[in-house]
């Protein structure tokens, strides 16, 4: 049931990409949603050598990825925040999961280049912005809606119910001779018709 | 400043066993690929092995592989060289160094090692 | 392993004159838009310095009577005008591939 519920939420998810509203924007596409995940691409030129490779929110270092080369130009491919990443010979991509509406932000690809020299330090970056479905804000919308009104007509059926029983009840229990009566009242009714006609 | 202060060099019979260290300061010792180069006395520089920034990837010159191991302490800004059954032709001035990226941009002013009986 | 080797093993020249040392390497240190050749210099009861790197990069700090150029195999390291802090042995050296190997020098005086 709860694993239902997830997947419901996570097709709920939809990512909407504002880029180009920032200095230093990324002129290529910059995230990518798949999975109820979103990956993140942070482009660097072919030419570079050694790198690192930092992806930012806001101002808080999320991921990092470090590619150096020993004297025997041996490749050591690190990272101290380490998430889900793919390194091309000119991107690297971060992978982001369970996203939710905290994930929309300013996020930025940091990317300090060591080799060739000299050293440099590039920022890209662009808004990630998480938005619902069309389709998933009306069923959220209508869905409590709904359930408090089934609640709502549940609740006054059994009152109704209840009332109606209630009332029965004590209409039996107050006049035991209710039914008599009314037969009776009949009784004399076609009595008094009959005499007339005979009068 | 940059510096590399190498120790442990010293007399050792052939056979013998020696721990050389490198006390690196100046600069963040755990960003970079760490080396050893050797020269002996009158000679050429011969490189001798090199270690990655986090002491995962080593790699050693095909005369002393299998007798010397590489190795760093990030922590205590070191770096290591523990060299075993120790030969004459291992007689040599050992430097340590810093791979910057695109050449060995610091050296220490090295630590003698005599093998001799 | 990659062979350098180097020449002449040694030179003198006058000060003020240019010097040319020249490394060879057994196979191509080109890869992409790079030459994995550096030059040092060690002079006497020093530990080597870094002169050159890329075959044509100054260290930063390297006075620019230095220079490098060549590709491929074939390498040159050049003095414009030798001054007497030169006198050093100057070594190329390769990082192309493992184990990286170094020339056997070559040493530089002042005629």
């Known amino acids: 049931m709860k694993s239902g519920l997830w997947y419901f939420f996570l097709f709920c998810l939809r990512i909407k990409v504002l880029t180009g509203e920032i200095n230093g924007s990324a002129n290529y596409e910059m995230f990518i949603f798949h999975n109820g995940g979103v990956q993140i691409l942070c482009k660097y030129p072919d030419i570079v050598q050694q790198f690192k490779m930092q992806l930012l929110k806001g101002g808080q270092i999320l991921c990092d990825l470090t590619k150096t080369k020993g004297s025997g130009n041996t490749v050591s491919i690190k990272s101290l925040k380490f998430c889900h990443s793919q390194l091309s010979n000119n991107s690297v991509s971060f992978f982001l999961y369970n996203l939710d509406h905290s994930h929309a932000n300013y996020y930025f690809c940091n990317l300090s280049i060591f080799d060739p020299p000299p050293f440099k330090v590039t920022l890209t970056g662009g808004y990630l912005h998480i938005y619902e479905s069309q389709l998933c804000c009306q069923l959220k919308f209508w869905l409590p809606i709904g359930c408090a009104a089934f609640v709502v007509v549940c609740i006054l059926g059994c009152i109704l119910i209840c009332w109606l029983t209630k009332k029965k009840y004590s209409s039996s229990v107050h006049d035991p001779n209710g039914e008599y009566m009314f037969m009776r009242a009949v009784n004399t009714a076609k009595k008094s018709r009959l005499t007339d006609v005979t009068l | 400043e940059v510096q590399l202060v190498e120790s442990g060099g010293g007399l050792v019979q052939p056979g013998g066993s020696l721990r050389l260290s490198c006390a690196a300061s100046?600069?963040?010792?755990?960003?970079?690929?760490m080396d050893w180069v050797r020269q002996a006395p009158g000679k050429g520089l011969v490189w001798v092995s090199n270690i990655d920034e986090s002491g995962s990837i080593t790699e050693y010159s095909p005369f002393v592989k299998g007798r010397f191991t590489i190795s760093r302490d990030n922590a205590k800004n070191t770096l290591y060289l523990q060299m075993n059954s120790l030969r004459a032709e291992d007689t040599a001035v050992y430097y340590c160094t810093r791979w910057g990226r695109f050449g060995f941009d610091s050296w220490g002013q090295g630590t003698l090692v005599t093998v001799s009986s | 392993d990659i062979v350098m080797t180097q020449s002449p093993d040694s030179l003198a020249v006058s000060l003020g004159e240019r010097a040319t040392i020249n490394c060879k390497s057994s196979q191509s240190l080109l890869s992409g838009s790079f030459n994995y050749l550096t030059w040092y210099q060690q002079k006497p009861g020093q530990p080597p310095k870094l002169l050159i790197f890329y075959a044509s990069t100054r260290e930063t700090g390297v006075p620019d009577r230095f220079s490098g150029s060549g590709s491929g195999t074939d390498f040159t390291l050049t003095i414009s005008s030798l001054q007497a802090e030169d006198v050093a042995v100057y070594y190329c050296?390769?990082?192309?591939?493992?184990?990286?190997?170094f020339g056997p020098g070559t040493k530089v005086d002042i005629k």
């Open positions: 100046g600069f963040t010792f755990s960003d970079y690929w």
């Open positions: 050296h390769h990082h192309y591939n493992a184990p990286p190997t």
